[in-house]
């Protein structure tokens, strides 16, 4: 004969646990139904009546099967430097992520607590490591034979053009100026993508970034020596 199916609420066998989507109510000492995502427990179960669930109100949610008396509040609206990548619904919290050109300097469980603008490498410096959603740009000085004349969070050091006759030699922040009308480009433009520039002058090489034990979520951008606009908090 098939085992008899117990309907909630029911007293569990000694030593056994309640089934999936049920919880043990200490007061009633019964296995009772949990509420589904998007709902909460309006009335707790008794020995004779099961949990009464109700839908979450606007701007509140429950993501899991639960028996909480109140739904959780959705986070505040996304700040100006963030975009809403997941809306607040009865079943899920709002998620804010940093908008393009920014990265998450301080993360929270879901989304970002502090967004900050990606570092812009000044002329003479190029991007050694691009920014990501959770890490800032890393800049490096342009090695001999390469240059960057922009202030940019994306531009790498590019090779100087090779001239038949040089009018003005290039440097780290300026391309070479040729007198001839048909300059040729440098042989190995791919070299500028290397994290450590290859250089014949050892004093001009930049150390390869070394990994460290610190978390890889961070930053912001100083404008002069005063503190930068401190990014924004999205709670």
């Amino acid at each position: 004969l098939p085992a008899q199916v117990a309907f909630t609420p029911y007293a569990p066998e000694p030593g056994s646990t309640c089934r999936l989507r049920e919880y043990y109510d200490q007061t009633a000492q019964m296995c009772c139904s949990k509420c589904s995502p998007g709902q909460h427990a309006k009335v707790f179960c008794t020995k004779t009546s099961d949990t009464v669930c109700d839908s979450c109100e606007d701007s509140t949610y429950t993501q899991l099967w639960n028996w909480v008396p109140e739904c959780l509040s959705c986070g505040s609206r996304c700040s100006s430097d963030q975009v809403e990548t997941q809306a607040c619904t009865r079943e899920q919290n709002r998620i804010c992520t940093c908008r393009p050109g920014w990265y998450c300097a301080l993360s929270k469980q879901e989304g970002c607590r502090l967004c900050a603008p990606l570092r812009k490498c000044r002329p003479g410096f190029g991007v050694a490591r691009p920014g990501t959603e959770t890490s800032d740009v890393v800049c490096k000085p342009c090695a001999p034979g390469t240059f960057s004349n922009t202030t940019s969070s994306t531009d790498i050091c590019r090779p100087h053009q090779i001239c038949n006759v040089v009018a003005i030699p290039g440097n780290a922040s300026m391309d070479a100026v040729c007198t001839s009308t048909s300059p040729t480009r440098s042989m190995a433009p791919g070299a500028v993508h290397l994290p450590q520039p290859v250089s014949t002058r050892s004093q001009h090489t930049q150390p390869t970034p070394e990994p460290s034990t610190a978390p890889s979520t961070s930053f912001l951008l100083p404008m002069g020596p005063s503190p930068p606009a401190e990014g924004s908090t999205g709670d």
């Epitope: 000085p141 100083p222 930068p228």
Partner: antibody, heavy 121, light 107 residues
Framework: EVQLVESGGGLVQPGGSLRLSCAAS????????LSWVRQAPGKGLEWVAY????????YYSDTVKGRFTISRDNAKNTLYLQMNSLRAEDTAVYYC??????????????WGQGTLVTVSS | DIQMTQSPSSLSASVGDRVTITCRTS??????LPWYQQKPGKAPKLLLY???KLAEGVPSRFSGSGSGTDYTLTISSLQPEDFATYYC?????????FGQGTKVEIK
């Protein structure tokens, strides 16, 4: 108000270890690159180590490379300098400094009050 | 490594004097040069950055000039509170070295 407060200095024997800490407040810690700079008694300034805001990039002076490790805890707003295999020439006041925002704003704009490390037998 | 040669190592001057300190680098540092002031027993303080830009709260009697490998800090009219040691520094490739310092003393 930006504040950087170093701690952990003291007297240590040659070959010993010490860990310096720097508690930061008054700014968005996780968005700034940080460094350690030292000054031997009666001498000039010497840059020691740098860590970028996310802890991805660390650079060291040749005099401490392989012996010192810079790290940070952005959740605790704290910068660290683990100093191993200490030598007499490491005796100095160690300053925790904010900056450089390397490649973009190249300077040290705030300095702690310093903590004295003395390496002597 | 980039060598920083700061001169003079010390100088004596009177209140109201114009004071000039120079810093020469062994290769171009593209104006990635700050100047700091340090008083005895105190931490250094940023005076100028990018060779010529005045840091916040620094009096206008301080000025900087230079490019490439040659840089100058000028105090147009020395004040009693300016007696201190001054350091230049480069932020080109690592290691980021400081000049050896210039001590400005009262004549």
């Amino acid at each position: 108000e930006v504040q950087l407060v170093e701690s952990g200095g003291g007297l240590v024997q040659p070959g010993g270890s010490l860990r310096l800490s720097c508690a930061a407040s008054g700014f968005a810690f996780s968005t700034y690159d940080l460094s350690w700079v030292r000054q031997a008694p009666g001498k000039g300034l010497e840059w020691v180590a740098y860590i970028n805001n996310g802890g991805i990039s660390t650079y060291y002076s040749d005099t401490v490379k392989g012996r010192f490790t810079i790290s940070r805890d952005n959740a605790k707003n704290t910068l660290y300098l683990q100093m191993n295999s200490l030598r007499a020439e490491d005796t100095a006041v160690y300053y925790c400094v904010r900056g450089p925002f390397y490649g973009s704003a190249n300077y040290f704009d705030y300095w702690g009050q310093g903590t004295l490390v003395t390496v002597s037998s | 490594d980039i060598q920083m040669t700061q001169s003079p190592s010390s100088l004596s001057a009177s209140v109201g004097d114009r004071v000039t300190i120079t810093c020469r680098t062994s290769e171009s540092i593209y104006s990635n040069l700050p100047w700091y002031q340090q008083k005895p027993g105190k931490a250094p303080k940023l005076l100028l950055y990018d060779a010529t830009k005045l840091a916040e709260g620094v009096p206008s009697r301080f000025s900087g000039s230079g490019s490439g490998t040659d840089y100058t800090l000028t105090i147009s009219s020395l004040q009693p509170e300016d007696f201190a040691t001054y350091y230049c520094q480069h932020f080109w490739v690592t290691p980021w070295t400081f000049g050896q310092g210039t001590k400005v003393e009262i004549k």
